[in-house]
């Protein structure tokens, strides 16, 4: 009867340049070991090579020379005694593309190349991008650990080198930005900026990168109220501090715009004399329209900002002057009030 040599291995495998792949494999061979037990040696060879002369791509035989170009990158994984011939290929290179065959040797009786079951390896261009991991959301002033990793990469071959770039990193020293991990303390101005992690394999021309846009949460800042007068001159006042008095002529029309810088956007609401104004008068953007102001419609106006990271408010006093003539009179600003605008 014919000796039984069998090999289970996939016909083809594809891996991206610079990445790793594990090719599962098992084999069987005829063995009757009642008299001696010589060592079992297994080999992976490039197709078309004569096993007696060729350098191997991977083996468990310490006396056989391994091809320098596959040394350390092609490795037998698993226990060959348990007939496991699985092959790990790391830091794949374009020139690794091709067919490979497996061979078993044990003493003088077992010597066999499994030429019928070749493994076809295809190495394609690297399109895999690194992953950037961090806990979202980023919060202004709170140190956050970011990590960069390349899926499908492994320990085999030269190490990966990392480099981080982005406006948010400007204060960091260059050494910090060459690690796969970095700690970033984001600022409000970093929101919306790009952060890039570039991964390169040392000694190779294989580079890949991923860019993320930073989403930095920060408390409301730069709260301001702008008052637009409907007098045809397009004049605007900007209120930045509480308690300012703004005199205005009766019958005037105003737009009050409350602006604030925050992320996520804060919710804005208007109050007059402590009472919330009718939503129909206000817009989502925090604009309040006061058409044709009457003598009794002045008082303290407050823009209130609500936000998960803190609330703020800004108030001013609208002082309505009765109309005495049709001329535009501008009086000098006194004790924290603005000139009278008509």
């Amino acid at each position: 009867e014919k000796p039984v040599y069998e090999l289970q291995v996939q016909k083809s495998v594809t891996v991206q340049e610079g990445l790793c792949v594990l090719v599962p494999c098992s084999f069987s061979y005829p063995w009757r070991s009642w008299y001696s037990s010589p060592p079992l040696y297994v080999y992976w060879f490039r197709d078309g090579e004569i096993p007696y002369y060729a350098e191997v791509v991977a083996t468990n035989n310490p006396d056989r020379r391994v091809k320098p170009e596959t040394q350390g990158r092609f490795r037998l994984l698993g226990d060959v005694q348990k007939k496991n011939c699985s092959l790990s290929i790391g830091d794949a290179r374009m020139e690794d593309t091709g067919s490979y065959f497996f061979r078993v040797e044990r003493g003088r009786d077992v010597k066999y190349s499994y030429q019928q079951n070749k493994l076809n390896l295809e190495v394609t261009a690297l399109i895999e991008k690194p992953d950037i991991h961090f806990l979202e959301p980023l919060e202004s002033g709170r140190p956050t650990r970011l990590s960069c990793s390349l899926p499908g990469s492994c320990e085999a071959g030269p190490p990966l080198t990392f480099s981080w770039t982005g406006n948010a990193l400007s204060p960091l020293d260059p050494e910090t930005t060459r690690s796969s991990e970095l700690t970033l303390t984001p600022r409000p101005e970093d929101h919306g900026t790009n952060l890039t992690c570039q991964v390169k394999r040392q000694g190779a021309q294989v580079t890949t990168e991923r860019t993320v846009q930073l989403n930095v949460s920060y408390a409301p800042q730069n709260l301001a109220i702008s008052i637009f007068f409907r007098n045809g001159t397009g004049t605007a006042l900007r209120i930045l501090s509480n308690g300012m008095s703004v005199p205005i002529q009766e019958g005037q029309s105003l737009f009050l715009a409350c602006t604030v810088d925050s992320n996520p956007p804060a919710s804005l609401s208007w109050f007059r004399e402590g009472k919330a104004l009718n939503p129909s008068q206000t817009s989502m953007s925090g604009t309040l329209e006061l058409p044709n102001i009457g003598a009794r419609e002045g008082g303290e106006f407050t823009c209130r900002v609500q936000h998960p990271l803190g609330s703020q408010h800004l108030s001013f006093i609208l002082s309505v002057q009765r109309s005495s003539s049709s001329c535009i009179c501008v009086t000098e600003k006194q004790q924290g009030s603005w000139p009278l605008l008509t």
Partner: antibody
């Protein structure tokens, strides 16, 4: 037990061809490299070439490239050497020898077959 | 080119015999091995392998046979010649195509 059984040869006319056989047994045919070696009467040994059935690899000594053609039939585990355009210089004993393993030696030999070229 | 010396070596039984083989170039194969072999051919027989890879005895070969050398110079030694050792000894290199045999050394009784 590995055996290489040779046949063919004998007395042949100049200008003709002869096909020598080397039938292998006792091992897996694809696992051995089969070499052919020439020995003229009272002379030394000359390597002609090899045939490796494992990957159908054939190597020739440049001197015999136009003289010898190596082929094989896997189904009968036989390697053939055809010698063409025979002259008296081709009169010799031809051996086939098998080698396998990393040691690289011709560890099994056929009994040899004699070719005499004469009109 | 493989140059074997001497061409003929007359010995007495029990003597030591030494045969030299010089190669015209290094016969270290690209895989790191040196495929230098020694064969013995007795009259009317096929050659038989004695030594492979410079110094390794083939199975069944008596330990009175030993091989040594490196690069281009190699030696076969027979420590105590016996009657069954008589014949023609050939060195052979299987590192570079064309593979080549030495010219042979005839070991004979003095």
């Amino acid at each position: 037990q590995v055996q290489l059984q040779q046949s063919g040869g004998g007395l042949v006319k100049p200008g003709t061809s002869v096909k020598l056989s080397c039938k292998a047994s006792g091992y897996i045919f694809t696992e051995y490299i089969i070499h052919w070696v020439k020995q003229r009467s009272g002379q030394g040994l000359e390597w002609i070439g090899w045939f490796y059935p494992g990957i159908i690899s054939i190597k020739y000594n440049e001197k015999f490239k136009d003289k010898a053609t190596l082929t094989a039939d896997k189904s009968s585990s036989t390697v053939y050497m055809e010698l063409s355009r025979l002259t008296s210089e081709d009169s010799a004993v031809y051996f086939c020898a098998g080698h396998e393993g990393y040691d690289g030696a011709m560890d099994y030999w056929g009994q040899g077959t004699s070719v005499t070229v004469s009109s | 080119l493989m140059t074997q010396t001497p061409l003929s070596l007359p010995v007495s039984l029990g003597d030591q015999a030494s045969i030299s083989c010089r190669c015209s170039q290094s016969i270290v194969h690209s895989n790191g091995n040196t495929y230098l072999e020694w064969y013995l051919q007795k009259p009317g027989q096929s050659p038989k392998l004695l030594i492979y890879r410079v110094s390794n005895r083939f199975s069944g070969v008596p330990d009175r046979f030993s091989g040594s050398g490196s690069g281009t110079d190699f030696t076969l030694k027979i420590s105590r010649v016996e009657a069954e050792d008589l014949g023609v000894y050939y060195c052979f290199q299987g590192s570079h195509v064309p593979w080549t045999f030495g010219g042979g050394t005839k070991l004979e009784i003095k």
